[in-house]
Interface confidence: low
């Protein structure tokens, strides 16, 4: 059992109060983390509470302001970036969000040597992406889908690409589907380690079908938003990778990097680029049918000024039981010899582990092993490899940081975090300085989050960076719910669950149960992290039991569980939620006449299918921005797990797994369907089709749309949404207002 340390006990119980919905909507109990912005082995930058940019030197203990809040305020800057030679800072303002990661902004360059903004050859606006070279102060930026280079901030720009066109050709930035489903970044350009070369992707969306939706705004006529968006089976972007010498950019111009022949024989994706040295680069490619990935190491040919990718440097990663990788194919971390690398992929037992690849993948040396999974490689130094895993005490929802000594033989393993603050901290991430001289640990729970600074050689804690004291004090008089993480063993499947229980929970009483589900492939909901959110309020104030269950298809418990849903989305995820509910009823404290389920996005799909399962278990449920048919969702994501919606592939299951096909089954449940009309991700079309099917089947249901809101339903919509859902659930559970 994991009981979250909820508070420092106050002897005067009558001063304790339950959480309110207002607490949640106001973010009263939000926490802070501290991630140093490392600029060397022993120095980092941090934006202080009063908005000064401060440089800290760990070894001297000194700190000084490099940029005042007055300078920041003069251009309304919300972000900054120091050039590696420490001569200039870019200041970012006029932030304008586009999709999940992308945004445009105005950039000003501030010269630290003379305390003035750089005048002449100013940057155009708005810029889609801007970054310094890793050495010196060269600038690369993307404007109107084309890439530009400046040797110095005050110099005129050199235009690298000329074919950029809105919604057609994207240079140095991803199109919608690559941003959301493949790169998970706003950029698609990469400097070589010393800034000699700049690699970039070109995405050609000319032939991609366009999703169009109305944006109502305030005008007499709504605007139409058009996004090239490949749905399952549709034409995909065509990607090409180029590299340009930034020292003499006009000399030979951008050189295209060849695609491995076995990849190029059919539709494919580019998945990531990793520079190894200034003259060696590693590209990862993926077949459209995403069970084969190729890692290709390419070398610069000085004589031809081209990039050569010999077949002997192609490493194939293939899955015979599912798709390649976890959510994404893992990226390599190269060792100091600049050819061998460390990478996480499935071992022979079907668990994701770190492997060392020297020559071929077949001859890979397995570095970690066990019935748990390595999750992230943080840093490889000459003598150590730092990684995270969920090995400790066999809880898949934990994350601890480990160090493996690779300089000695046999390599020894040490858990850096397991015993630091064992009750408070079981879910960590880390951030390392150059050469791992120092690192920050950020603990997300289950107790109140805390960020600490450590010596990279001895692992000694140097200081606390952020301990959320104000939050701790604010929670002292709050009746937080209890949380427990346990597992159910059902038919050789382990179902981990998190149960959130009312503060005065009594096993002899009956409580309404709300299942919160996500359930998407390679996701994990049952995690040992701190949160005070809507479901905390529902348990604390409204006396509900809330449960989260990780069923088949979820991550970090081996390929058997993960790949169980391959080509069959919408089947086992739903079955496992239902199985868990039956087990919860058997525990004796659930009122089986008051059970609900809710989910957002993939969770909205699962909750809809669970409600329409015909089991009679659920009284009501909510689907927020659900997928309703996999034919409506993005190709890259959908086909990874479902194959293609073609007759000779998997069309039959595409058709069988829709929410619409089960419209009749909603007759005996109360269903609340919610969607934003400007959802660029899971299109409003999904809910429109559910509503149409329910109307055609003459099934009553409730619905709410949020005009001009995207997949996140942010701002005032958030308040309205949670208030609306609260009323719905309280009505369903016959709880008084």
């Amino acid at each position: 059992i994991v009981l979250r340390p909820s508070r420092v006990h106050n002897s005067e119980e009558n001063t304790m109060r339950a959480l309110t919905l207002k607490d949640i909507l106001n973010g009263t109990f939000s926490y802070k983390t501290f991630f140093p912005n490392w600029i060397s082995g022993q120095e980092y930058l941090h934006q202080s509470a009063d908005n000064n940019i401060v440089l800290y030197n760990i070894e001297t203990g000194q700190s000084y302001t490099i940029l005042s809040n007055r300078t920041m305020k003069s251009v309304n800057a919300s972000n900054y970036g120091l050039s590696p030679d420490r001569q200039f800072v870019y200041l970012e303002s006029d932030y304008s969000k586009l999709w999940r990661y992308s945004y445009t902004a105005t950039y000003y360059i501030y010269d630290l040597s003379n305390g003035e903004f750089v005048r002449g050859n100013e940057l155009p606006r708005p810029i889609q992406y801007l970054c310094w070279s890793p050495v010196g102060s060269k600038l690369a930026y993307v404007y109107q889908n084309n890439i530009y280079l400046k040797q110095r901030p005050g110099d005129p720009p050199f235009q690298i690409t000329f074919n950029g066109r809105e919604n057609k050709i994207f240079n140095g930035i991803p199109d919608w589907v690559y941003e959301e489903e493949m790169l998970a970044t706003k950029y698609a350009l990469w400097w070589s380690p010393n800034g000699k070369f700049l690699a970039y992707a070109e995405f050609n969306d000319t032939d991609i079908p366009v999703i169009a939706y109305s944006y109502y705004g305030d005008e007499q006529y709504p605007r139409t938003i058009n996004i090239p968006y490949p749905k399952a089976g549709a034409k995909n972007p065509v990607v090409r990778i180029f590299i340009i010498d930034t020292t003499y950019p006009a000399y030979v111009g951008p050189q295209e990097v060849p695609v491995p022949a076995m990849i190029a024989s059919s539709d494919y994706y580019f998945s990531w680029l990793t520079w190894v040295t200034d003259e060696r680069v590693c590209l990862q490619w993926l077949k459209r049918v995403q069970n084969v990935s190729v890692l290709s190491i390419c070398d610069f040919r000085e004589d031809w000024q081209t990039w050569d990718c010999p077949k002997t440097q192609e490493h194939i990663e293939e899955s015979r039981t599912g798709w390649a990788g976890g959510f994404f194919v893992s990226t390599p971390v190269f060792s100091y010899d600049a050819i061998s690398y460390y990478k996480i992929f499935s071992d022979k037992d079907g668990y994701k582990h770190i492997h060392y690849i020297k020559d071929t993948v077949e001859n890979a040396i397995q570095i970690t092993s066990g019935k748990w999974e390595a999750i992230n490689i943080f840093r490889v130094t000459q003598d150590s490899l730092f990684y995270s895993s969920n090995e400790f005490e066999e809880y898949p929802g934990r994350r601890n940081i480990y160090r493996i000594s690779i300089g000695s033989y046999p390599p020894s393993k040490k858990c850096v975090t397991c015993h630091l603050r064992k009750e408070r901290c079981q879910y960590y991430t880390a951030s390392f300085s150059d050469y791992a001289k120092y690192y920050a640990l950020v603990c997300y729970g289950p107790g109140i989050p805390i960020s600490t600074l450590h010596d990279g050689r001895t692992d000694q804690e140097i200081k606390i960076l952020e301990e959320n004291k104000e939050l701790e004090n604010a929670l002292k008089n709050i009746q937080l719910p209890k949380e427990e993480i346990k597992k159910l063993e059902v038919d050789e499947i382990t179902l981990w669950y998190k149960m959130i229980l009312p503060p005065q929970f009594d096993r002899s009483k009956k409580y309404p149960l709300l299942i919160q589900v996500y359930g998407g492939p390679c996701s994990q909901s049952v995690r040992s992290v701190f949160a005070v959110n809507w479901i905390s309020y529902l348990a604390s104030k409204e006396g509900m039991v809330i449960a989260l269950v990780d069923g088949r298809g979820t991550a970090f418990q081996g390929d058997k569980l993960l790949y169980a849903v391959y080509r069959k989305l919408g089947v086992y995820e739903v079955e496992d939620q239902i199985t868990a509910v039956r087990k919860f009823i058997e525990m004796g404290f659930i009122d089986e006449k008051r059970i609900a389920i809710w989910g957002w996005s993939y969770g909205g799909y699962v909750s809809s299918l669970a409600l329409a399962s015909g089991t009679g278990l659920f009284k009501c449920g909510i689907a927020v921005a659900p997928v309703s048919s996999w034919e409506y969702y993005a190709s890259v994501y959908t086909e990874r797990f479902m194959g293609l919606p073609t007759k000779d592939d998997n069309l039959e299951h595409y058709k069988n797994s829709t929410v619409m096909a089960r419209a009749e089954y909603f007759r005996n449940v109360d269903y609340l369907l919610i969607h934003g009309t400007a959802d660029d991700n899971v299109h409003f079309q999904n809910s429109a089709q559910i509503a149409k099917a329910l109307v055609n089947a003459q099934v009553d249901f409730q619905a709410m749309w949020y005009s001009d809101q995207n997949h996140g339903l942010s701002g005032l919509s958030t308040n309205h949404l949670y208030t609306h859902m609260t009323h719905f659930l309280k009505q369903c559970f016959s709880l008084s207002d």
Epitope: N204, T206, D207, P209, G233, A234, K235, V238, R240, E256, P258, V259, A261, M262, A264, S265, S266, D267, K287, R288, V289, V292, I316, E318, G643, L644, T646, K647, D648, D649
Partner: antibody, heavy 124, light 108 residues
């Protein structure tokens, strides 16, 4: 230089069998999806079937008129593609071509090659 | 079953522009390829992925795509362009390969 050379065609009676071969050279055969296409006298091109690479599962797909009667296989060590034809019908009379289309880097030309074809005549 | 529909014949005078269409319900999802076949010869690829031209194919050959129709355009037709032209749907993402019925281009 890429070459595809079909052989094994000839005259066969209805209900009979025939095995066609296609010898490939000049490219990495094991990386290519290989197809058979036929053309009846005076008619259009008709796809017969294809075999994927080993890395793509080595699976075969067939056009409806030949499914269950024809079988495609490959021998990557010998760079050879085969078409086993059983229960032949008069309407199977055609020139049979093997062909490969590999789209390489989008700035380059596709590798697209056909053999010269081999004539199969099914007649009593 | 899925079909690609082409006009049986198109006639055009030398120097004029010939347009050969090919329609099919799946063409919004699948690329089209165009082959030229002269009597007694194997087909030759003239357009791939709807609009790309292989090296060695004259610039007068171009391709376009709109909805369920793809079009092969030959501008400034020459006598040597007289041939049969076949469209083929892409097979790169596991659908079956399908050829259109072919269009005989006659240069008057």
């Amino acid at each position: 230089e890429v070459q595809l050379v079909e052989s094994g065609g000839g005259l066969v009676e209805p209900g009979g069998s025939l095995r066609l071969s296609c010898a490939a050279s000049g490219f990495t055969f094991s990386d290519a999806w290989m197809n058979w296409v036929r053309q009846a006298p005076g008619k259009g091109l008709e796809w017969v079937g294809r075999i994927k690479t080993k890395s793509d599962g080595g699976t075969t797909d067939y056009a409806a008129p030949v499914r269950g009667r024809f079988s495609i296989s490959r021998d990557d060590s010998k760079n050879t593609l085969f078409l086993e034809m059983n229960s032949l019908k008069t309407e199977d009379t055609a020139i049979y071509y093997c062909f490969i289309t590999v789209i390489v880097v989008s700035s380059e030309s596709p590798l697209d090659h056909w053999g010269q074809g081999t004539l199969v005549t099914v007649s009593s | 079953s899925y079909e690609l529909t082409q006009p049986p014949s198109v006639s055009v005078s030398p120097g004029q522009t010939a347009r050969i269409t090919c329609s099919g319900d799946e063409l919004p999802k699948q690329y089209a390829y165009w082959y030229q076949q002269k009597p007694g010869q194997a087909p030759v690829l003239v357009i791939y992925k709807d609009r790309q031209r292989p090296s060695g194919i004259p610039e007068r050959f171009s391709g376009s795509s709109s909805g369920t129709t793809v079009t092969l355009t030959i501008s400034g037709v020459q006598a040597e362009d007289e041939a049969d032209y076949y469209c083929q749907s892409a097979y790169s993402i596991n659908t079956y390969v399908i050829f259109g019925g072919g269009t005989k281009l006659t240069v008057l």
